[in-house]
């Protein structure tokens, strides 16, 4: 169909309760383009009509509420007047049990579920809260350890909880609840967040660490687009360079002629301590010599690689 | 002893800018929240902007949304406020406060005071 | 936002007579009060915060009491240097917000 397929990473959601995600990837978003999404490489678009359970809402795909059936890989297709990019995601669906100190913690959870407060300063935890405009968020109210919070050293702005003179007692299973208000309908939202107490500034000390990949291999098609993302949390007056090498060499010195290969525009997000930094690898077009290579993530002294594979045949297929 | 010190204060007109700075001394600066508070001539107090140790949390008033900016330099014990597309209901005595408990205010500089007049 | 009302605007005393001073929010703001004095020609000084608690050095004779929406700023007898500008503060909601405050004048 002539749409380039990009994969983007895992998302761990919630059941039972309303998921957005945002069909956003610069600059293919940013000019004049038509956005439409499909569940598991189904032909027929998710629904537009608002009063369903899962449907399109702009560039988004929104989920009023999630259920344990949603998990699977949702694509949206970005057409341009001359291009048109097939984005995969793969959206995975867990039962939330906040509450219950039985289950143990949940693996891979984002910085968004795992925040840090520090000893003795004037801190604040997040509630990352996105959905699209359609969507109307009422006040945010904070627990912790399944109570509600009260108290003279806690106050709400906005989406944070602003915690005066941190102590050691303050870690543990934050929770913040919002009730969000679609077409009428009200939906609860409810996001956990594994609070750590550090005493110094710094994320790690000076060592920035990568987050992702993690010296791994990625399955890849033959002639596919694949772009794959660094990320890098460091200290916010960091120096360390961000970059993706190969042999030893610059992806964009490397593919200097062909261009196949290139390095994107670094982004970061701020955080209470420390910066996430994203930067990614593009591949046009996977070709056989990519394969077994590793394509290094480099921060500062720390590294860490992906090396590209064929996927496994199908045997179905025959 | 704790102290701050407002600087940057001057006569501007309408529609120009105008960036203020605080030296912060005696006290741990890189642990507390930072705010700007002003006092028009004669009038009571009006908080206008607040910023987190890190940078990380930063609001304001309504009255300067989209038109002022905090920031601060922790290096430097620094606090900053910069003020664009002035207005004159901007004139004020414009104080530098610690936060104490976020978002009471226990130390206080003496104040840079902002004219903005055509 | 949150208004904070204060009264009286005016408080005329003498010296050793005690000073009542009230400040009304339009909603309740819990135990997230505090109160200021201003001297002339000086910044303000942070005197009570969360309602009754003394900050650094503020003498005994100034306490604060109340809760919700209504609260009191008391100065159990006044000295000379008392006589000045007070302001309450509110930081239960964003923005924070000032009464417009009282002057105690001596009479």
């Known amino acids: 169909d002539g749409c380039k397929d990009i994969f983007m990473k895992n998302e761990i959601l919630s059941a039972s309760q309303p998921f957005a995600f945002n069909c956003t990837f610069p600059p293919i978003t940013s000019g004049e383009v038509s956005v439409t999404w499909y569940k598991n490489s189904s032909k027929i678009p998710v629904s537009k009509i608002i009063q369903s359970r899962i449907h399109q809402d702009e560039t988004w795909i929104l989920f009023l509420p999630m259920e344990w059936g949603d998990s699977g890989v949702y694509q949206c297709v970005i057409k341009g007047r001359d291009s048109c990019h097939r984005i995969h995601v793969n959206l995975t669906v867990f039962e939330k049990h906040w509450c219950d100190t039985s289950i143990g913690g949940l693996p891979n959870l984002s910085d968004e579920y795992k925040q840090i407060l520090h000893l003795g300063k004037d801190d604040s935890l997040t509630c990352h809260l996105h959905f699209p405009k359609s969507c109307v968020l009422g006040p945010i109210k904070w627990y912790k350890d399944c109570n509600e919070i009260k108290g003279e050293r806690f106050t709400v702005l906005e989406t944070r909880l602003l915690v005066s003179n941190v102590s050691a007692e303050d870690r543990g299973n934050y929770a913040c609840q919002a009730i969000l208000t679609h077409s009428g309908k009200q939906y609860e939202v409810l996001n956990g967040i594994t609070v750590s107490i550090t005493e110094r500034a710094g994320y790690g000390g000076s060592v920035p660490k990568i987050i992702y990949p993690k010296n791994h291999s990625i399955e890849v098609q033959l002639g596919t687009t694949l772009i794959v993302d660094c990320n890098v949390t460091d200290t916010k007056d960091n120096t360390n360079l961000r970059c993706w090498r190969v042999n030893n060499t610059l992806v964009d010195d490397y593919y200097d002629e062909s261009k196949r290969i290139r390095e994107g525009v670094e982004t970061h997000v701020s955080f209470r301590e420390h910066n996430l930094y994203t930067v990614n690898i593009t591949f046009l077009e996977v070709k056989m010599e990519d394969y077994g290579l590793p394509f290094m993530c480099h921060a500062g002294v720390s590294t860490a690689y992906i090396i590209l594979q064929l996927p496994a045949p199908d045997f179905r297929a025959y | 002893e704790v102290q701050l010190v407002e600087s940057g204060g001057d006569l501007v007109q309408p529609g120009r800018s105008l960036r203020l700075s605080c030296a912060a001394s005696?006290?741990?600066?890189?642990?507390?929240?930072m705010h700007w508070v002003r006092q028009a001539p004669g009038k009571g107090l009006e908080w206008v902007s607040v910023?987190?140790?890190?940078?990380?949390?930063?609001a304001y008033s309504d009255s300067v949304k989209g038109r002022f900016t905090i920031s601060r330099d922790n290096a430097k014990n620094s606090l900053y406020l910069q003020m664009n597309s002035l207005r004159t209901e901007d004139t004020a005595l414009y104080y530098c406060?610690?936060?104490?408990?976020?978002?009471?205010?226990?130390?206080w500089g003496q104040g840079t005071l902002v004219t903005v007049s055509s | 936002e949150i208004v904070l009302t204060q009264s009286p605007a005016t408080l005329s005393l003498s010296p050793g007579e005690r000073a009542t001073l009230s400040c009304r929010a339009s909603?309740?703001?819990?135990?997230?009060l505090a109160w200021y004095q201003q001297k002339p020609g000086q910044a303000p000084r942070l005197l009570i915060f969360?309602?009754?608690n003394r900050a650094t050095d503020i003498p005994a004779r100034f306490s604060g009491s109340g809760s919700g929406t209504d609260f009191t700023l008391t100065i159990s007898s006044l000295e000379p240097e008392d006589f000045a500008v007070y302001y309450c503060?509110?930081?239960?909601?964003?923005?924070?917000?000032f009464g417009g405050g009282t002057k105690v004048e001596i009479k």
């Open positions: 909603q309740s703001i819990s135990s997230y």
């Open positions: 005696g006290f741990t600066f890189d642990d507390y929240a």
């Open positions: 969360n309602v009754a």
């Open positions: 503060q509110q930081r239960s909601n964003w923005p924070l917000t």
């Open positions: 910023i987190s140790w890190n940078s990380d949390v930063i």
């Open positions: 406060t610690k936060g104490h408990k976020w978002s009471f205010f226990d130390y």
